[in-house]
Interface confidence: low
């Protein structure tokens, strides 16, 4: 099978880290500096990604794998393979077009990234608020008075977060 495949594509035998530099040349040449091929059978090597500016190098480029970037302190990755760096905000804030803004009342954000989310509505689950929410933390729901029987747990974890949505400005 392998021999047949090579007859159809003379370059199929070139391993990762090399390229087949001519149509019928079945000799594999190594990728030049600052380039890579992560799979076999490549006719060219790809240029290594350069982590510049707000990006910093998390993993150096090799002949068989691209460089990987992350973001400098104060920024976080967005997109596949950290294609963008977005500014961090403090907990209790979200990033808007005008910069970091505090979460509106009734919403929270417990991370340095993402948007403010509404507090959990304990009453939807027949619970009562045990601990009030803040800009940085969701409310903690407790059992309804009817549930307060001997042996019953006094605290339950917060309900799963609702679908994220932008809080009113």
């Amino acid at each position: 099978f392998e021999r047949t495949r090579s007859l159809q594509d003379p370059c199929s035998n070139c391993p990762a880290g090399t390229f087949c530099d001519n149509n019928r040349n079945q000799i594999c040449s190594p990728c030049p500096p600052n380039s890579f091929s992560s799979a076999g059978g490549q006719r060219t090597c790809d240029i290594c990604r350069q982590c510049k500016g707000v990006f910093r190098t998390r993993k150096e480029c090799s002949s068989t794998s691209n460089a990987e970037c992350d973001c400098t302190p104060g920024f976080h990755c967005l997109g596949a393979g950290c294609s963008m760096c977005e500014q961090d905000c403090k907990q209790g804030q979200e990033l808007t077009k005008k910069g970091c803004k505090d979460c509106c009342f009734g919403t929270f954000n417990d991370q340095k990234r993402g948007i403010c989310r509404p507090w959990t509505n304990c009453s939807l689950d027949g619970k009562s608020v045990l601990v009030n929410g803040t800009k940085e933390r969701d409310v903690v729901c407790g059992p309804s008075p009817a549930d307060l029987s001997p042996g019953a747990s006094s605290v339950t974890p917060p309900a799963p977060a609702r679908e994220p949505g932008h809080s009113p400005q």
């Epitope: 021999r3 090579s6 007859l7 003379p10 035998n13 391993p15 880290g17 090399t18 530099d21 001519n22 149509n23 019928r24 040349n25 079945q26 000799i27 594999c28 040449s29 190594p30």
Partner: antibody, heavy 116, light 107 residues
């Protein structure tokens, strides 16, 4: 079956030229590149270069640039090696070899002797 | 160019012996190594390609192994017809280069 048949031995004087032929059979000639290898008396194998049998484009090793020419006649499935301005140090057996992953089929070799 | 160093250069052995020839490359050549057998007055014959794959019709007593910079050709039980010179060759970069050869002689 795959066969590469080379032309016979040659005795040449210094300064002359020689043309070695390599006729292929048993496969589609233009599907595989053809490589040339030199072996001086009592010595090892030395890669000279190769020719793209589809396009006719030759590639020469550094030591074989200038006096050595690879060519083809695809109508008769034949590759050629021409050496001009022969020198005594060109005395060697010259092999053609089909290339698929490696030099998988070789001609029987052509002895070129350069002597005054 | 990539240098290939074969060892030993000469090897005396008897029929039935297990014979091992090594080939060291001056830099990483992945698995892009072939082994050839050449008898006096004859053209080389391909034995092994891609470091370990036997060419069509090559007896199973011949085997190849290795990757990176170190490769081995092993003849598990030497036969009378195996007395010859063996060459390794890399095809990882242009120009492809050959080792200096290992001559296997009858002890």
């Amino acid at each position: 079956q795959v066969q590469l048949v080379q032309s016979g031995s040659e005795l040449k004087k210094p300064g002359a030229s020689v043309k070695v032929s390599c006729k292929a059979s048993g496969y589609t000639f233009t599907d595989y590149s053809m490589h040339w290898v030199r072996q001086a008396p009592g010595q090892g194998l030395e890669w000279m270069g190769w020719i793209n049998t589809e396009t006719g484009e030759p590639t020469y090793a550094d030591d074989f640039k200038g006096r050595f020419v690879f060519s083809l006649d695809t109508s008769v499935s034949t590759a050629y090696l021409q050496i001009s301005s022969l020198k005594a140090e060109d005395t060697a057996v010259y092999y053609c070899a089909r290339y698929d992953y490696a030099m998988d089929y070789w001609g029987q070799g052509t002895l070129v002797t350069v002597s005054s | 160019d990539i240098q290939l160093t074969q060892s030993p250069s000469f090897l005396s052995a008897s029929v039935g012996d297990r014979v091992t020839i090594t080939c060291k490359a001056s830099q990483d050549v992945s698995s892009a190594v072939a082994w050839y057998q050449q008898k006096p007055g004859k053209a080389p014959k391909l034995l092994i390609y891609w470091a370990s794959i036997r060419h069509t019709g090559v007896p199973s007593r011949f085997s190849g192994s290795g990757s990176g910079t170190e490769f081995t050709l092993t003849i598990s039980s030497l036969q009378p017809e195996d007395f010859a010179t063996y060459y390794c060759q890399q095809r990882y970069t242009t120009p492809p280069t050959f080792g200096g050869g290992t001559k296997v002689e009858i002890k």
